[in-house]
């Protein structure tokens, strides 16, 4: 059966049951994911907006899939195996009475079972297994996965140590607060900012101090390290990633099949062998590609380069250049240009630099 082909998996709680406090729902679902992350290399992250891999839904009766719920009792919940769209999603019958304890139906225990399905597990014939098809309350404080559950999930994803080998010394994780730190590429992805460097990326959730480092391969196993440019078209849930003369398309955080493709499909002349940086401006619906000391402008609607390009970066972006490492768009009016360990906030309406920062200023260094 299907499995997630990555180790970094997002979930979102679409709506909350009125049976429980929101915090209790959040906690039950978080702990249920933790049960599975404790025994695998998988990492789960809750997002509040955008398209998650696993959507948690409370619904009654018909709710948008083929499998309408049946009122109180009977079917408590169901979940779809890994995949795009509805794949991975877990639905809980709102006609049940969801609880944190032994009365009603315990949300944590049910969620552990359903998340098992979301990760690709089928039912177990072992009555002690959480993946046994019928619900039975057990003390949640002493709850443990059975040997059968662990065998099943590890046959799909391996054990937790498998993705935690130390990186090579010559390609070790860069120190985030090193004042000389530079980035290869930076882009927004919904409400997050991805900072790429070598084999790694840092994830910064807007307006939150916490940052996490991840291997690119843990999120996108089919992508190379050393991403050189990246941009997002948020309205389409698309991210484009560039390395050398190739690019990859990521939709809803999932790599699209039939990639990589040649950057020359955008209309670059043959002498362009790689992209240094790229940024999409949704106001103009144009993408700016920066190559050495020049830039091109691409019309995303018409899917072609605008005439009159390339132009010199220094001529049209006052104070920027001659070359840049990375750039992203934010707050509807700024480009953030990265040059080595320096970063420039550039107001594209005023057409000037409004702030000079260190490249790692986003991380509270």
């Amino acid at each position: 059966g299907p499995v997630w082909r990555k180790h970094y998996i997002t979930y979102r709680i679409n709506n909350y049951t009125p049976d429980m406090n929101r915090e209790d729902v959040d906690y039950a679902i978080r702990k249920a994911f933790q049960v599975w992350s404790n025994v695998t290399p998988l990492k789960f992250s809750k997002i509040n907006t955008g398209m998650a891999d696993i959507l948690v839904v409370f619904a009654r009766g018909a709710h948008g899939d083929f499998h309408a719920f049946d009122g109180k009792g009977g079917i408590l919940a169901h979940a779809f195996g890994p995949g795009s769209g509805i794949g991975g999603d877990a639905h809980f019958d709102e006609d049940e009475f969801w609880t944190t304890h032994s009365g009603g139906t315990n949300l944590f225990l049910t969620a552990v079972h359903e998340i098992g399905h979301s990760l690709g597990l089928g039912h177990s014939s072992d009555p002690k297994a959480v993946m046994f098809p019928t619900y039975k309350y057990v003390d949640i404080n002493t709850f443990r996965l059975s040997a059968d559950d662990i065998r099943g999930i590890q046959s799909l994803y391996g054990d937790p140590k498998e993705n935690q080998r130390l990186p090579n010394p010559d390609n070790s994780e860069p120190a985030l607060c090193d004042p000389n730190l530079s980035f290869d590429a930076v882009t927004t992805v919904g409400n997050k900012i991805f900072f790429f460097k070598d084999r790694f990326f840092w994830l910064k959730v807007s307006e939150r101090p916490k940052t996490s480092v991840n291997l690119i391969s843990s999120l996108w196993p089919t992508l190379p390290s050393g991403i050189e440019a990246a941009y997002e078209i948020e309205a389409r849930n698309q991210v484009f990633l560039f390395k050398d003369d190739k690019y990859w398309l990521i939709s809803n955080l999932r790599p699209e099949p039939n990639y990589p493709k040649s950057i020359h499909s955008f209309g670059f002349p043959n002498f362009v062998k790689k992209i240094d940086a790229a940024v999409f401006n949704p106001r103009f619906y144009r993408t700016y590609f920066f190559v050495d000391n020049q830039y091109w402008r691409y019309d995303e609607r018409r899917q072609m380069m605008d005439p009159g390009y390339p132009k010199l970066i220094t001529k049209n972006f006052q104070g920027i250049g001659p070359k840049i490492d990375a750039v992203f768009y934010s707050k509807n009016k700024y480009y953030y240009f990265f040059q080595g360990s320096n970063q420039f906030e550039y107001d594209f309406l005023l057409q000037r630099i409004t702030k000079t920062l260190k490249s790692n200023s986003w991380f509270g260094c």
């Epitope: 398209m51 959507l55 709710h63 899939d65 169901h78 794949g87 809803n252």
Partner: antibody, heavy 122, light 103 residues
């Protein structure tokens, strides 16, 4: 390459029976949900029936419940639709369509056959 | 049962136009909505799944948006090959279709 090829359509009298087949290739047949969707001449699409990869779960539209039976033979990579007590309003092109892998159907039809025409008329 | 209402039922437009088709569900279907294109005498083709995800091989001028009860399919710049009938769908329910014709 994923391919679905329907056969078995034709002219049948009201009250009669017909069995449609859909031969599949290019994917692991027993993993996938499969469905029948029909389209009356000049009209829109109407979902008819679906079956899980193992054949253990089946679903029907109210308009065909009790008259049509969906089944599959995973050893032959073939999907079937047995249609009994046919009515004039069952006249349509019948398409088979592939859904996702897994215990439940997403109703996400990513590959379709070309269709086979069933005409119910006296 | 959930009902799907698609509008308009027909639409005339010219090459290069931006076109929007809407689909409304009678109750929330989250993002469980798909869009298909069908040309005369041909089988339907999946364009967009899960409300906004572009099916592999579909040109990027097609985009989808929406969640809950209201959804849209947008073609940013109509091409000659886009004139066809478009259907929204969730589970076993299809919208009644929108026929897109050349003006």
């Amino acid at each position: 390459e994923v391919q679905l090829l329907e056969s078995g359509g034709g002219l049948v009298q009201p009250g009669g029976s017909l069995r449609l087949s859909c031969a599949a290739s290019g994917f692991t047949f027993s993993d996938y949900w499969l469905h029948w969707v029909r389209q009356a001449p000049g009209k829109g699409l109407e979902w008819v029936s679906g079956i899980s990869g193992s054949g253990g779960m089946t679903m029907y539209a109210d308009s065909v419940k009790g008259r049509f039976t969906i089944s599959r033979d995973n050893s032959k990579n073939t999907l079937y639709l047995q249609m009994n007590s046919l009515r004039a309003e069952d006249t349509a092109v019948y398409y088979c369509a592939r859904d996702i892998v897994g215990p439940y159907s997403a109703g996400l039809f990513d590959y379709w056959g070309r269709g086979t025409l069933v005409t119910v008329s006296s | 049962d959930i009902q799907m209402t698609q509008s308009p039922s027909s639409l005339s437009a010219s090459v290069g136009d931006r076109v929007t088709i809407t689909c409304r569900a009678s109750q929330s279907i989250y993002t469980y909505l798909n869009w298909y294109q069908q040309k005369p005498g041909k089988a339907p083709k999946l364009l967009i799944y899960a409300a906004s995800s572009l099916q592999s091989g579909v040109p990027s001028r097609f985009s989808g948006s929406g969640s809950g009860t209201d959804f849209t399919l947008t073609i940013s710049s109509l091409q000659p090959e886009d004139f066809a009938t478009y259907y929204c769908q969730q589970a076993g329910i299809f919208g009644q279709g929108t026929k897109l014709e050349i003006k």
